[in-house]
């Protein structure tokens, strides 16, 4: 048993490097120590991320990919370990780091928020749906007036630069819009957003943020909402939102507002139709919204309400198409 052998020495890995391989993504790489005796034994490596956020894990590989914001730099250590059922032997640590990019913290953007929507694909024969992305941010409090910001996103191996910006009064980019992206809102991979900047007066600090596509996906409103009145009953029906998810993946919330007495009836539904009793003297406003439900993914936020449809007194039946 090597672990019980007094003279057995575990040597640290060599050539430990950290390389940025994409937006908010680094590759840690090292080699086994060439001077290690008993190379045939089952060596593992213990990786410790020191910054920006502490984490540790074991691996048998000699490389490891990390997805993390890099605007504050990145530091990690690795050591060789040998495990047995009752003890673990470890070498000394070797460390490496990526320096934080230049720029004072107050120059980078703040309050970065992003949302995605499902849209009809421009290549419907290949893929019927794509995802749009909209991000907004605030200008850094210490950013000079001539600062200009530029946004990029990465999803998987694909990176895109923003081409459509909204600007503030000083002509600085404060929002970005991608009509169609490579993002898959059904996936579990993280979306990396990177905003860097330039100014003649100061170095602008970049900013990275990771988003879960599930968490930022804004469900479209239900489509083709129809309302009929028949002998004191409202028959309400709609189609699922524009989405790559099938019908059974949606829950709905229906809001029936009696404009005469101000009463609001709210119903949570799994079906795309509902019947409600009404009086014959009021006008009603009907709206529906959707959320992706648990059979298909982690339940998401409620989407946007459909446009109101008004029915009732003097408005026998209205259909709203959108």
């Amino acid at each position: 048993d090597l672990l019980n052998h007094k003279k057995f020495l575990l040597l640290p890995p060599v050539n430990f490097t950290i390389k940025a391989t994409g937006l908010a993504q680094v590759l840690l790489h090292w080699d086994p120590n060439p001077d290690q005796e008993q190379r045939h034994v089952d060596l593992e490596y213990h990786v410790k991320i020191n910054a920006p956020q502490e984490d540790e894990y074991d691996t048998r590989k000699t490389e490891s990919k990390c997805v993390t914001p890099l605007h504050e730099g990145f530091a990690a250590s690795v050591r060789t370990i040998l495990k047995s059922s009752h003890t673990t032997l470890a070498s000394s640590w070797v460390s490496a780091e990526l320096k934080a990019p230049p720029g004072s913290p107050g120059t980078s953007v703040t309050n970065l928020t992003c949302t995605t929507h499902t849209v009809v694909s421009s290549h419907t024969h290949l893929r019927p749906y794509q995802v749009s992305l909209r991000c907004t941010w605030l200008v850094g409090k210490d950013a000079p007036e001539d600062t200009q910001y530029f946004l990029y996103y990465r999803f998987g191996v694909l990176t895109e630069k923003c081409q459509e910006y909204s600007r503030d009064a000083l002509n600085r980019n404060t929002a970005c819009w991608f009509p169609r992206t490579f993002i898959n809102s059904k996936g579990f991979e993280q979306l990396a957003v990177h905003i860097n900047g330039s100014s003649k007066r100061a170095a602008i600090k970049p900013f990275d943020q990771l988003f879960s596509p599930l968490a930022i996906d804004q469900v479209n409103p239900p489509r083709n909402v129809t309302v009929e009145i028949e002998s004191n009953s409202l028959y309400i029906q709609w189609e699922k939102p524009l989405s790559a998810f099938p019908d059974h993946c949606f829950n709905y919330e229906l809001k029936i507002y009696n404009t005469k007495n101000g009463h609001i009836q709210k119903e949570k539904l799994i079906a795309n139709k509902f019947i409600s009793k009404i009086d014959d003297v009021s006008t009603y406003s009907i709206q529906v919204r959707a959320a992706v439900s648990s059979p298909c993914r982690m339940p998401g936020r409620w989407g946007e309400w459909s446009q109101p449809i008004y029915v009732g007194k003097e408005r026998k039946s209205l259909v709203e198409w959108h």
Epitope: H248, E267, K273
Partner: antibody, heavy 124, light 107 residues
Framework: EVQLQQSGAELGKPGTSVKLSCKVS????????IHWVNQRPGKGLEWIGR????????IYAEKFKNKATLTADTSSNTAYMQLSQLKSDDTAIYFC?????????????????WGQGASVTVSS | DIQMTQSPASLSASLGETVTIECRTS??????LAWYQQKPGKSPQLLIY???SLHTGVPSRFSGSGSGTQYSLKINSLQSEDVASYCC?????????FGSGTKLEIK
């Protein structure tokens, strides 16, 4: 209690048509979908299609598009399926089925209430 | 159309045993899967929906699991009244499709 009562057994000659009915009690069919499913002797279940009684819109499985016609009469709370150009391999039991309930449990795409089945025999 | 491959076609087990029936789909159906029980000469009865939700009134010895394209129905502690045919059905895409069925009998 929701009940789906289907019409009786039918004996049809090849080339003719039969019309099966499915009367629902205890639930307004405008609030659900009515599905039709068949089962040939000794075989498994096969989905024929469904109708939305609220607007009369049917959806069919491809192989039944020229065979079955689904309709519904909301005033009598009854769904119908007409089978045309009968052949011997249309001999089967035909079930109507639906989903009941809205705010919990299975969605409207699951069949949790079934008729007793109607036997159709095609023979010359 | 989504193809459903159900196995085995028939199954014989002893009372008190645990049995498992598999259902594979030709594409991801997002858990849009139901399991039905059908006794000879009777209409099918819903057991499981959304791949793993037990329908009201169904004994807890029945359970469903799976995701993506692989699903299964498990019956714990087999009872004599479980003798029946069992089939899966996907409702993720029209046309809805059923598996070919599994006939379960007692040894």
């Amino acid at each position: 209690e929701v009940q789906l009562q289907q019409s009786g057994a039918e004996l049809g000659k090849p080339g003719t048509s039969v019309k099966l009915s499915c009367k629902v009690s205890g639930y307004n069919i405008k609030n659900t979908y009515i599905h039709w499913v068949n089962q040939r002797p000794g075989k498994g279940l096969e989905w024929i299609g469904r109708i939305d009684p609220a607007n009369g819109n049917p959806i069919y499985a491809e192989k039944f598009k020229n065979k079955a016609t689904l309709t519904a009469d909301t005033s009598s709370n009854t769904a119908y399926m007409q089978l045309s150009q009968l052949k011997s391999d249309d001999t089967a039991i035909y079930f109507c089925a639906m989903h009941r309930g809205h705010s919990m449990g299975p969605g409207p795409y699951v069949m949790d209430a079934w008729g007793q089945g109607a036997s159709v025999t095609v023979s010359s | 159309d989504i193809q459903m491959t159900q196995s085995p076609a028939s199954l014989s087990a002893s009372l008190g045993e645990t049995v498992t029936i598999e259902c594979r789909t030709s594409e991801d159906i997002y858990n849009g899967l139901a399991w039905y029980q059908q006794k000879p000469g009777k209409s099918p009865q819903l057991l499981i929906y959304n791949a793993n939700s037990l329908h009201t009134g169904v004994p807890s010895r029945f359970s469903g699991s799976g995701s993506g394209t692989q699903y299964s129905l498990k019956i714990n502690s087999l009872q004599s009244e479980d003798v029946a045919s069992y089939c899966c059905q996907q409702y993720s895409n029209y046309p809805f499709t059923f598996g070919s069925g599994t006939k379960l009998e007692i040894k």
